[in-house]
């Protein structure tokens, strides 16, 4: 199978997940594909602790995460429930702003310079964070 027992080379391990922090920019879909080629996904933030960990690594730079509403409701790329899950939007966000003049609204979420989230045009070339979970079976205690 494709289950992982250790992180890919140059990825950062944290709390049984592996993270890749880019230093270049891509559109949201292209960043997502970069992650998927490693059988990973754009980062899914499920707790304040994970938010702080990611924020520490990316610094004050706009960075894509695995959250979008391109098909209507907001969805996490790994199926994590959005409505009941962790959220860290900036005040008055998301706003699906149309005033940018690029056509359409804003359907993809990113970390802003202070770590809080904003929705923006998915074609903007922002940095990105990939995440992949380590083999859950390896978390089981050994049989005695």
């Amino acid at each position: 199978g494709s289950e992982r027992t250790c992180c890919p080379v140059n990825w950062v391990e944290h709390e049984r997940s592996c993270y890749w922090f880019s230093r270049s920019g891509k559109a949201w879909a292209d960043a997502d594909n970069y992650c998927r080629l490693e059988d990973a996904h754009l980062v899914v933030v499920t707790s304040w602790e994970e938010q702080k960990f990611v924020q520490h690594h990316i610094g004050p730079v706009n960075t894509w995460m695995g959250l979008h509403d391109q098909n209507g409701p907001w969805k996490w790329v790994d199926g994590t429930d959005y409505e009941t899950g962790f959220k860290n939007w900036r005040p008055e966000q998301p706003d699906d702003w149309y005033g940018h003049g690029l056509g359409g609204g804003e359907d993809c979420a990113h970390f802003t310079d202070d770590g809080r989230w904003n929705d923006d045009v998915c074609q903007r070339p922002y940095r990105w964070v990939c995440e992949t979970e380590l083999d859950k079976a390896s978390q089981e205690p050994p049989l005695l």
Partner: antibody, heavy 121, light 107 residues
């Protein structure tokens, strides 16, 4: 030595099928996404398909979508391309290529020698 | 899809010449641009990745530059073994696409 070796090419009639294989050696095959790239006689290079490290995600050029299927067997260090409903315009040398990763950047850093597929009646 | 356009499609040059090949993308690809060399009957070989980074084992007479939509491959002093076809390729977005190639021939 890092090496990719394709096989399975040949002459096939339009509408027929063929399965290409690519045997990898000299590197940790399961750590790299892989691709197929083709080159029609006297023409340029065309990316055909890609597959993620563990095989969970696949990508296709529009020209082959629905007809070709990429797969891999990491236990055998082998990449495959199942080609169905073949057309004359699929005639080409087919190369398998390793996706080298250089930080955020990627490129086809290792190529096989290619296998010729001819679709003709 | 991102279209890649190379120019010229062919050129004639002599050993020792400085050769420049250009590649233009239909939209910005920042520096997600690779260059390959292909000799007749052989597989392509990676020369340059990330627009300007020299692949291991490639002679330093090869160099790449550019960002956004316009890129250049330069061979500072053409050697006999450099007569080949050169391709650019964008790795910004799937489907990955190649330029149509530039054939470097002996004058």
């Amino acid at each position: 030595e890092v090496q990719l070796l394709e096989s399975g090419g040949g002459l096939v009639q339009p509408g027929g099928s063929l399965r290409l294989s690519c045997a990898a050696s000299g590197f940790t095959f399961s750590s790299y996404a892989m691709s197929w790239v083709r080159q029609a006689p006297g023409k340029g290079l065309e990316w055909v398909s890609a597959i993620s490290t563990g095989g969970g995600n696949t990508y296709y050029a529009d020209s082959v979508k629905g007809r070709f299927t990429i797969s891999r067997d990491n236990s055998k260090n082998t990449l495959y391309l199942q080609m169905n409903s073949l057309r004359a315009e699929d005639t080409a040398v087919y190369y398998c290529a390793k996706r080298g990763v250089y930080g955020d950047f990627d490129a086809f850093d290792i190529w096989g020698q290619g296998t010729m597929v001819t679709v003709s009646s | 899809d991102i279209q890649m356009t190379q120019s010229p499609s062919s050129l004639s040059a002599s050993v020792g010449d400085r050769v420049t090949i250009t590649c233009r993308a239909s939209q910005s690809i920042t520096n997600f641009l690779n260059w390959y060399q292909q000799k007749p009957g052989k597989a392509p070989k990676l020369l340059i990745f990330a627009a300007s980074s020299l692949q291991s084992g490639i002679p330093s007479r090869f160099s790449g530059s550019g960002s956004g939509t316009d890129f250049t491959l330069t061979i500072s002093s053409l050697q006999p073994e450099d007569f080949a076809t050169y391709y650019c390729q964008q790795s910004y977005s799937i489907p990955w696409t190649f330029g149509q190639g530039t054939k470097v021939e002996i004058k």
